[in-house]
């Protein structure tokens, strides 16, 4: 499946109607906040706040639309973050070496 | 179901004060943030903060009101607004709401929160 | 966070005429908007989610419109109970509900 991408969800007015979406548009957020501090992505201190953010984002909508959470999709979006932000994270780095259980691979819900 | 704040008072400057914020009819869940807005007498709403009503407790505050003001959820059907330094500028009709994606759908009557020597 | 700039006030209307109040947030919220409606001595009240659906019990005269950045909100058939100050609010930005607009008083004549 493809990557997620930062296309307008919602664009012909009015907020988007269904989870697909608005999990596009969780991710678009997430992107924004990511982007900058890309040098620190394995440091947790810097990007626990936008991870943890994001699994609102997605628990949130998941609620809206009357679905569980995790979810598949959510699920994808969790795994696609460490994919593209922390697959080169070495678990041994002191400043990301108390990673949350779900940044180690397992992506059950979690407490921050 | 509803919403209602406690804990308004007249205070110093410099005070410290909370705010508590009973909701009945609900109990918090991710479907919910819980947020505290305030309206200072003749003029507009300014949101200061929310917290998600899921398991991770997250807060976002106001750039102005990190710092001094710190929302908590302390059960499933309570959260608080605690305020440290306040002055003048902080008197207030203080709402608690409860906040979806969609909007605000609920609203408590306010508590009036005074900060004069 | 997205900042939210309002219509001045006030917006003037006659009964049976038409207003309309305008919103741009900072950032794109995509449709993201709610407007609400105060009267003097009350919270606010839920008007226009989702930048565009009425709310439970908003008469259709109430129009809500707009995405990305730039919303509107209009009046149809004024009556004088609609003399009230409206304000804009980015209901989620991708973090949390947050800023409201300025406010905008509509005066019926």
């Known amino acids: 499946q493809p990557l997620p991408t930062t296309g307008t969800p919602g664009s012909e007015g009015g907020t988007v109607k269904n989870y697909e979406t608005a999990v596009q548009f969780c991710w678009n957020h997430y992107k924004d906040q990511m982007d900058p501090i890309e040098k620190d992505w394995c440091d947790w201190a810097m990007i626990s706040r936008p991870y943890s953010t994001l699994r609102d984002c997605l628990e949130h909508f998941a609620e809206l639309f009357d679905l569980g959470f995790p979810n598949p999709l959510a699920e994808r979006i969790i795994f696609e973050t460490h994919q593209i932000h922390f697959a080169n994270c070495s678990l041994v780095q002191p400043t990301f070496s108390d990673p949350p259980e779900d940044v180690r691979g397992s992506h059950h819900h979690h407490h921050h | 179901q509803s919403v209602e704040e406690s804990g308004g008072d007249l205070v110093k400057p410099g005070a410290s004060l909370t705010l508590t914020c009973t909701a009945s009819?609900?109990?918090?869940?991710?479907?919910?943030?819980m947020c505290w807005v305030r309206q200072a007498p003749g003029k507009g709403l300014e949101w200061i903060a929310c917290?998600?009503?899921?398991?991770?407790?997250?807060s976002y505050y106001a750039r102005w009101a990190k710092g001094r003001f710190t929302i908590s959820k302390t059960s499933s059907t309570t959260v608080t607004l605690r305020m440290t330094s306040l002055t003048a500028a902080d008197t207030a009709t203080y709402f608690c709401?409860?906040?979806?994606?969609?909007?605000?759908?609920?609203w408590g009557p306010g508590t009036l929160v005074t900060v004069s020597s | 966070a997205a900042v939210m700039t309002q219509t001045p006030s006030p917006v003037s209307g006659v009964v049976g005429g038409t207003v309309t109040i305008k919103c741009q947030a900072s950032?794109?919220?995509?449709?993201?908007f709610s407007w609400y409606q105060q009267k003097p001595g009350q919270p606010p009240k839920l008007l226009i989610y989702?930048?565009?659906d009425l709310a439970s019990g908003v008469p259709s005269r109430f129009k809500g419109s707009g995405s990305g950045t730039q919303f509107t909100l209009t009046i149809s058939d004024l009556e004088c109970a609609d003399a009230a100050t409206y304000y804009c609010?980015?209901?989620?930005?991708?973090?949390?509900?947050?800023?409201f607009g300025g406010g905008t008083e509509v005066v019926v004549k």
């Open positions: 609010q980015c209901s989620y930005d991708g973090s949390s509900p947050n800023a």
């Open positions: 709401v409860r906040s979806d994606a969609w909007g605000v759908n609920l």
């Open positions: 950032q794109s919220i995509y449709g993201y």
């Open positions: 989702s930048a565009s």
């Open positions: 009819g609900f109990s918090f869940s991710s479907r919910y943030y």
């Open positions: 917290i998600f009503g899921g398991s991770s407790d997250n």
